[in-house]
C-alpha cells in the first residue's frame, strides 16, 4: 500500500516545512485514495474486459451509487458551500458499503483495497471538523448496508466484476467533482 | 491520437457576439477528470484562461469576463462552443481551445488546438 | 488571482548553455504549477507538469523544480530548437493564469 499523506519522502527531507492547512491535508488525502483507486482500476482493468465494456447500463441500474448533480450546490452555478459539503461527506458515507463490498474482490491488491476503505474514513472525519451543520448529515442505515451487502456478494461473477468496474468508476469520479468543490471553500 | 481544431470567424465587428467551436477527437467529454478550456492569445502578448467545461457539465469562467462568455458542450457531436459578446478591438487575439485530463485536476492542458485568430 | 511573474523577460544563449528560467507565484501554489513551450506562430506545448513530472516526447534537457511559490525550469544544454517564449501557469485556483513568459533567443 502507498504511503499515507503527510509521511511521503517529501515530508521526511523537510522537516521545517509550514505544517499543512486543514484544506491542504483534505485534499491530500483525496488525491492518495485516487491513487489507490487507480491501482485497483489497473487490476481489475487487466484481469477483465469490463473497462470496454458496453453493458454497464445493464449493472448500473442495480447500483445506487452517489453521484453529484447541480442541486448539491457543488457546481459553480449555485455554488452552496454548505449543502454542498453535506453532499460530500453524505456520499462517502454511503460508499462505505461498496467500499467494504471491494475487500475481497482483489487478489495482488488487497492491501491497496483496505487503504483506500480506511483512507475514506480518515478523509470524512476530516470533512465533518470542517462542517458546521452536522445534523443534516444522514448516516446510512446498517440493515439495509448489510443486505445490500448481501445481495451484492450473492451476484455471478460477471456482474461481480461489472460490480467492482462500476464502484471504482463512480467512486472516482465523486471524489474529484469533491476535490473541485472543496478547493472552492 | 488527440486532436483539437477551432473554428469561427475571423473578423467580428464591434458589439457583435463571437461564436467558437471547438471540435475535439481521441478523447471522450464524458470521461470523469477531462475538461476543455479556451484562452485567448493577443499579438505579441502572454496566454490568458477564459472558460472551462468539464466532463461532468460544470463550468468555470474567468471573472474579470464572466459577463460576457458563455461555455457550452455537445458530447454527441465531441464539440465545445464559447460565445463572447459585446466584442471590442481590444478582444483581438488567437484564442485557442485545449484539453486538460488528469485525476487530481491539476488543469495542466497536454493538448491544444491550432488556434484560430479574431481580428 | 493568483500572479505569476517570471524572469528574466528575456534570455541570449549559446547552443549547450544550460540555463535556469524563473516562475513565482503571488501565494503558495503547492505542485500546481506547469510549464509551456511556444515556437514563433504555434500553439503552446505542455512541457513539464505538476512542477518536475516530464511529458511523454518531451526531451529529457528540460526538467522542472521548486514547490509553494518559487519554480525554476531548466534546460540542461540549449539546442537551436529551444527557441521561443517559456510560459509558467497557475493550476491551482481559478482563474487559471499564466507568466508573462520568458524569450529564449540564440546570442
Known amino acids: 500500500a502507498p504511503v499515507p499523506p503527510g509521511e511521503d519522502s517529501k515530508d521526511v527531507a523537510a522537516p521545517h516545512r509550514q505544517p499543512l492547512t486543514s484544506s491542504e491535508r483534505i485534499d491530500k488525502q483525496i488525491r492518495y485514495i485516487l491513487d489507490g483507486i487507480s491501482a485497483l482500476r489497473k487490476e481489475t482493468c487487466n484481469k477483465s474486459n469490463m473497462c470496454e465494456s458496453s453493458k454497464e447500463a445493464l449493472a448500473e441500474n442495480n447500483l445506487n451509487l452517489p453521484k453529484m448533480a447541480e442541486k448539491d450546490g457543488c457546481f459553480q452555478s449555485g455554488f452552496n458551500e454548505e449543502t454542498c459539503l453535506v453532499k460530500i461527506i453524505t456520499g462517502l458515507l454511503e460508499f462505505e458499503v461498496y467500499l467494504e463490498y471491494l475487500q475481497n474482490r482483489f487478489e495482488s491488491s488487497e492491501e491497496q483495497a483496505r487503504a483506500v476503505q480506511m483512507s475514506t474514513k480518515v478523509l470524512i472525519q476530516f470533512l465533518q471538523k470542517k462542517a458546521k451543520n452536522l445534523d443534516a448529515i444522514t448516516t446510512p442505515d446498517p440493515t439495509t448496508n448489510a443486505s445490500l451487502l448481501t445481495k451484492l456478494q450473492a451476484q455471478n461473477q460477471w456482474l461481480q466484476d461489472m460490480t467492482t468496474h462500476l464502484i471504482l468508476r463512480s467512486f472516482k469520479e465523486f471524489l474529484q467533482s469533491s476535490l473541485r468543490a472543496l478547493r472552492q471553500m | 491520437q488527440v486532436t483539437l481544431k477551432e473554428s469561427g470567424p475571423t473578423l467580428v465587428k464591434p458589439t457583435q457576439t463571437l461564436t467558437l467551436t471547438c471540435t475535439f477527437s481521441g478523447f471522450s467529454l464524458r470521461t470523469s477528470g477531462v475538461s476543455v478550456g479556451w484562452f485567448r492569445q493577443p499579438p505579441g502578448k502572454a496566454l490568458e484562461w477564459l472558460a472551462l467545461v468539464y466532463w461532468d457539465d460544470d463550468r468555470r469562467y474567468n471573472p474579470s469576463l464572466k459577463n460576457r462568455l458563455t461555455i457550452t458542450r455537445d458530447t454527441s457531436k465531441n464539440q465545445v462552443v464559447l460565445t463572447m459578446t459585446n466584442m471590442d478591438p481590444v478582444d483581438t487575439a488567437t484564442y485557442y481551445c485545449a484539453r486538460s485530463y488528469d485525476d487530481y485536476l491539476y488543469y495542466a492542458l497536454d493538448y491544444w488546438g491550432q488556434g484560430t485568430l479574431v481580428t | 488571482d493568483i500572479v505569476m511573474t517570471q524572469s528574466p523577460a528575456t534570455l541570449s544563449v549559446t547552443p549547450g548553455d544550460r540555463v535556469s528560467l524563473s516562475c513565482r507565484a503571488s501565494?503558495?501554489?503547492?505542485?500546481?504549477l506547469h510549464w509551456y513551450q511556444q515556437k514563433s506562430h504555434e500553439s503552446p506545448r505542455l512541457l513539464i507538469k505538476?512542477?518536475?513530472q516530464s511529458i511523454s516526447g518531451i526531451p529529457s534537457r528540460f526538467s522542472g523544480s521548486g514547490s509553494g511559490s518559487d519554480f525554476t525550469l531548466s534546460i540542461n544544454s540549449v539546442e537551436p530548437e529551444d527557441v521561443g517564449v517559456y510560459y509558467c501557469?497557475?493550476?491551482?485556483?481559478?482563474?487559471?493564469?499564466f507568466g508573462a513568459g520568458t524569450k529564449l533567443e540564440l546570442k
Open positions: 501565494q503558495s501554489i503547492s505542485d500546481y
Open positions: 505538476s512542477v518536475s
Open positions: 501557469q497557475n493550476g491551482h485556483s481559478f482563474p487559471l493564469t
